[in-house]
């Protein structure tokens, strides 16, 4: 579908004259019609098969046609198609005089004609007009020509339809050719397809508008590239959705059990070593001066004897400070002015000079230290028992006596404890997390099943004819005490009366 | 194809007792840890038992220590959830679960779950 249009520019008639040569009186009140039909090698009447139009009277003799509206007709002419153009035409422009107002064919004289030319060629569909002049022996008419396709019509023939739409259909506008151009943030055949969020997951991701990121179930982030955990895990991650892959140091289905006590928690105090012995379980190993499961408690810096030779030592704000006994010095009393003839050594302890009698050396029997050996060993300074096991000196030897639950020369073992057997009377052991639980048999309560408790055998009224009722504690048995009258375990003969049998 | 299938749950008075199974397939049986969990409606799923792939280490929660045993049988692909002294509180989905590896860490696999009513 399209428009030839013709634009009339100017007409010479200047003597006034029709095609006869007979004058027009009182000058020629000139129109024109117009006829475009299909290529003809010679151009003859008939029908306008590509459409007429008619001007209205436009001047009078010669005159220029302006380029907008002219007593109501339309400058440039118009002669619309509804097919595709062939590329090639035929025209044939008539200009007729009007005596009168009625310019239809059927009211004018046959003789009111003034002029008649006939072209024909190709003509492509253009914006650009083509200029023409016809010259006859009496008049010219100067015109330009073009075609071009009606809106929404494109391409050489104008026989592509292309509307430009922003709705659910399409978001586009139309090239000159009639192809589509999408809108920004469109793509697809039809333009109907929006363009995600740069980045955005191609699986994981989809979007309904341009620059959106919307997730799929099972991914989040802003490109819909980080799956969502397992509902309910704690301390892990995931490479695909609802997996829950503990992170380093945590266990259990949900990763919220405590692996690693010791990074998480930091319980050791003061420098000590962290030890991971289990689920929420630690070992601190304290550094010297410290003690205490966490290693909380500083020990008394005088407790690791630091001073030498007899030296006393007493505590400060800043540390400790050694009182030498006579003939030493120095920050730990180490240095004597003593020699092998002061006699120095304590204890039996037997003396060698040095450096030529300028200094000496002890040495001390066992169970003496010290460099006069005026200390006796204590083997308990370098805190050896384990699990809070307290140290003990026993002579030449030491031993540590544990925490329960621990066992070893250190109490370096953990150990169940239910392994000594501390339920009494059968009792059955139940290991619990911090101790244990006995389930006494009958008979038996306490915490170790130790009380025995008394089964009342004259509960069930065993004694006859009033007689008093005794539980024999020992034995959980009972024990009759007969009415005057009666005799026999449960009180049931009457004296006198010998028990009747059946045989 | 990995699947974990439970069966068991149903309605109990409270006090009785239920045995829960998961049958799986699609791997290796006895070279994954399996476990079970629960979620009542609203509430955050709750990690309840596990059995690592040999049987030597199973861990339970403490709202079913004592209660709840678990154990697995691997000639039967089958691992078993014994439920005993059942409470209201007990109510709930129970699923079964695999973290995919040997040891009870995390969750890879899950199965459609069976529901359990513990109501007089």
């Known amino acids: 579908s399209g428009v030839f249009q013709l634009q009339l520019q100017e007409f010479i008639n200047e003597r006034g004259v029709l095609a006869s040569g007979r004058p027009c009186e009182p000058g020629c009140r000139t129109f024109f019609r117009v006829c475009l039909k299909h290529f003809q090698a010679v151009v003859s009447p008939g029908p306008c098969t590509f459409g007429t139009v008619s001007t209205p009277v436009l001047g009078t003799n010669s005159f220029a046609v302006r380029d907008d509206s002219s007593g109501g007709g339309r400058n440039p002419l118009q002669l619309p198609f509804n097919f595709t153009w062939p590329g090639t035409f035929s025209l044939i422009i008539e200009a007729w005089h009007a005596p009168g107002d009625d310019l239809r064919p059927e009211a004018l004289p046959p003789d009111a004609l003034i002029s008649k030319i006939a072209i024909q060629g190709s003509l492509a569909v253009g914006q650009n007009w083509l200029l023409d002049e016809q010259t006859s022996t009496l008049t010219r008419l100067r015109y330009s020509y073009r075609v071009i396709c009606s809106d929404n019509y494109y391409g050489d023939n104008c026989s592509r339809l292309c509307k430009k739409r922003n709705d659910h259909f399409g978001h586009y506008v139309c090239q000159p050719d009639g192809n589509l151009s999408c809108l920004p943030g469109w793509t697809g055949e039809y333009c109907q397809q929006p363009i995600c969020l740069s980045g955005c997951h191609e699986q994981n991701g989809y979007c309904s508008k341009p620059a959106e990121c919307l997730c799929r179930p099972g991914w989040q982030g802003r490109l819909c590239n980080e799956c969502i955990p397992h509902n309910g895990c704690r301390h892990g991650t995931c490479s695909t959705p609802w997996q829950c892959t503990c992170d380093e140091g945590w266990g259990g289905l949900f990763c919220d059990q405590d692996l690693n006590y010791c990074t998480h928690h930091s319980p050791c105090k003061n420098g000590a070593t962290c030890s991971n012995s289990g689920q929420r379980s630690y070992t601190c190993t304290c550094r010297p001066g410290y003690t205490g499961v966490d290693c909380e408690l500083e020990l008394s810096e005088c407790d690791s004897n630091p001073c030498r030779n007899g030296g006393s030592c007493k505590d400060q704000e800043d540390g400790y400070h050694c009182l030498c006994p006579p003939g030493y010095y120095g920050l730990h009393c180490e240095h004597s002015t003593l020699s092998c003839a002061d006699s120095p050594c304590f204890n039996g302890g037997s003396c060698r000079e040095r450096n030529q009698g300028a200094n000496y050396a002890c040495e001390c029997p066992p169970n003496f230290t010290g460099s006069n050996c005026e200390k006796k060993v204590d083997r308990c300074t370098s805190n050896p028992c384990a699990n809070g096991g307290q140290c003990l000196n026993r002579g030449p030897s030491r031993m540590c006596r544990c925490r329960p639950g621990f066992t070893g020369t250190y109490c370096e073992l953990h150990v169940s404890d239910c392994a000594r057997n501390p339920c009494a009377h059968g009792g059955t052991c139940h290991d619990l997390e911090n101790g244990l639980m006995c389930t006494c048999p009958a008979g038996f309560s306490g915490r170790r099943c130790e009380v025995r408790t008394s089964i009342d055998a004259c509960a069930s009224s065993p004694c006859f004819n009033r007689a008093t009722c005794y539980t024999d504690l020992s034995t959980d048995t009972f024990v009759c005490n007969c009415p005057y009258g009666f005799v026999g375990s449960r009180c049931e003969f009457p004296v006198g009366l010998p028990p009747s049998f059946p045989w | 194809k990995v699947q974990l299938v439970e069966s068991g749950g149903g309605l109990v008075q409270p006090g009785g007792s239920l045995r829960l199974s998961c049958a799986a397939s699609?791997?290796?049986?006895?070279?994954?840890?399996i476990g079970w969990f629960r979620q009542a409606p609203g509430k955050e799923p709750e990690g309840i038992s596990c059995i690592s792939s040999s049987g030597g280490i199973t861990y339970y929660a403490d709202s079913v220590k004592g209660r709840f045993t678990i154990s697995r049988d691997n000639a039967k692909n089958t691992v078993y959830l014994q439920m005993n002294s059942l409470k209201p509180e007990d109510t709930a989905v129970y699923y079964c679960?695999?973290?995919?590896?040997?040891?009870?860490?995390?969750?890879?696999?899950t199965g459609q779950g069976t529901q359990v009513t513990v109501s007089s």
């Open positions: 699609g791997f290796t049986f006895d070279d994954y840890a």
């Open positions: 679960a695999t973290p995919g590896i040997a040891a009870c860490r995390g969750i890879h696999y």
